[in-house]
């Protein structure tokens, strides 16, 4: 098995994680997605789940935590609005397949958020005050209660940073986007990985 | 390695039918949505249409200028692609080509070497 | 209908100098700050070939002299420096809304 790497994302308090899971294959629209932690030593404890089976373009909101999925599109959008110095630790974004395990749709994210705020790398430096908004009518869905620490991955991304406000209502400042465009597979054997119901090792495509 | 092979092409007449295939080897086909594109000689590209896959209960898109006359269909089990075209029109006259997206809206990275097909009287 | 307008409609560059390629979108083609925008190249008796996918991805196997950028309505296609197997005909399309679109195609040659 090949070993899962990890993302460095360094941001400020206040500021917000933007990440797009990129799932593409059809089969996958309506499964129930989830956004996990992973602690050291511990199993991922999925913090927030798109309902089951997962609605189009509906958000669901857990906290600060944002889940968007366009089924249309093949897209998980994940947000952390407001982030908090305790928010850092390991993410991962996943889709169930009950009673299989989890597929993992990226390279985990090792996410560092420091105390006061200033513009990202390669951000304009203008739009430091720049307003976010969250969607107003959000649902809360129950997500399954079993882990597990194997996934299978779905393609590296490639990460940008970015700023942007998109429209909707509820106003936070002080927010920059990190948004994690992800690359698609081209390799057919790795598409054959993907796709094998059998197939459930780690597989990091490079 | 990724084929797509376009074949049922030929000479109809205007009003006349045409059915055309497209078989896929070389990655698992009930996976992806099929399309097809045409490109009438010395035009530009023209999308057809799409089929989605069993678990987007194989819905069909197509392009209004053929909308109505053709049909895209397929067989997971023959690795397969069909377009019916019915009604044949002079502007119908085009190389069509099979095309294989990388997921959900995706890029077309596969294309068949394309099949001519001629409506004349 | 998204319509897909490129410029120019043929463009003729010397050896070793820039092209452009520009494509504008009657509407918007991004999702979830994705741009659903390719663009293909196609050389006379072939089927078009893709280039860059969303926006500014290179295909596997593509020149790193090929880039792509844009987002929303706005994009363009770059050859950094045109080599003369560039000389095609390219075209971009859109695949965030059905019924997918491609632009009228740009003849590119060498002056």
């Known amino acids: 098995a090949t070993k899962l790497t990890e993302e460095k994302y360094e941001l400020k308090e206040g500021q917000t994680l933007d990440v797009k899971c990129d799932y593409t294959l059809e089969k996958f629209a309506s499964s129930q997605k989830a956004w996990q932690i992973i602690r050291d030593g511990e199993m991922p404890k999925t913090l927030a789940c798109t309902e089951r089976p997962s609605k189009n373009s509906h958000p669901v909101q857990v906290g600060r935590i944002i889940l968007e999925d366009a089924h249309d599109h093949g897209l998980l959008r994940v947000r952390m609005v407001n982030l908090q110095v305790e928010d850092s630790g390991l993410y991962q974004c996943v889709i169930y397949q009950p009673p299989k395990e989890p597929h993992m749709l990226f390279d985990r994210i090792r996410l560092v958020v420091t105390k006061g705020f200033s513009g990202t790398p390669g951000s304009n430096e203008n739009s430091t005050q720049n307003v976010y908004k969250i969607p107003p009518t959000t649902t809360k869905a129950l997500c399954p209660l079993y882990t597990s620490p194997r996934t299978v991955t779905q393609a590296p991304p490639k990460s940008t940073a970015d700023v942007s406000t998109p429209d909707s209502e509820i106003n936070l400042t002080n927010v920059t986007d990190i948004i994690r465009e992800q690359k698609l597979i081209s390799e057919e054997d790795l598409e054959q990985k993907l796709i094998s119901e059998e197939d459930l090792h780690h597989h990091h495509h490079h | 390695e990724v084929q797509l092979v376009e074949s049922g092409g030929g000479l109809v007449q205007p009003g006349g039918s045409l059915k055309l295939s497209c078989a896929a080897s070389g990655f698992t086909f009930s996976t992806y949505a099929m399309h097809w594109v045409r490109q009438a000689s010395g035009k530009g590209l023209e999308w057809v249409g799409r089929i989605r896959t069993k678990s987007s209960n194989y819905a069909t898109y197509y392009a209004a200028s053929v909308k109505g006359r053709f049909t895209i269909s397929r067989d997971d089990s023959k690795n397969t692609a069909y377009l019916q075209m019915n009604s044949l029109k002079t502007e119908d006259t085009a190389v069509y080509y099979c095309?294989?997206?990388?997921?959900?809206?995706?890029?077309?990275?596969?294309w068949g070497q394309g099949t001519l097909v001629t409506v004349s009287s | 209908d998204i319509v897909l307008t490129q410029s120019p409609d043929s463009l003729a560059v010397s050896l070793g100098e820039r092209a452009t390629i520009n494509c504008r979108a009657s509407e918007s083609v991004d999702t979830f700050d994705y741009s659903f925008l390719h663009w293909y190249q196609q050389k006379p008796g072939q089927p078009p070939k893709l280039l860059i996918y969303?926006?500014?991805n290179l295909e596997s196997g593509v020149p790193d002299r090929f880039s792509g950028s844009g987002s929303g309505t706005d994009f363009t296609l770059t050859i950094s420096s045109l080599q003369a197997e560039d000389v095609a005909v390219y075209y971009c399309q859109q695949s965030n809304e059905d019924p997918y679109t491609f632009g009228q195609g740009t003849k590119l040659e060498i002056k």
């Open positions: 095309t294989r997206d990388m997921g959900i809206r995706r890029q077309f990275a596969y």
């Open positions: 969303r926006a500014s």
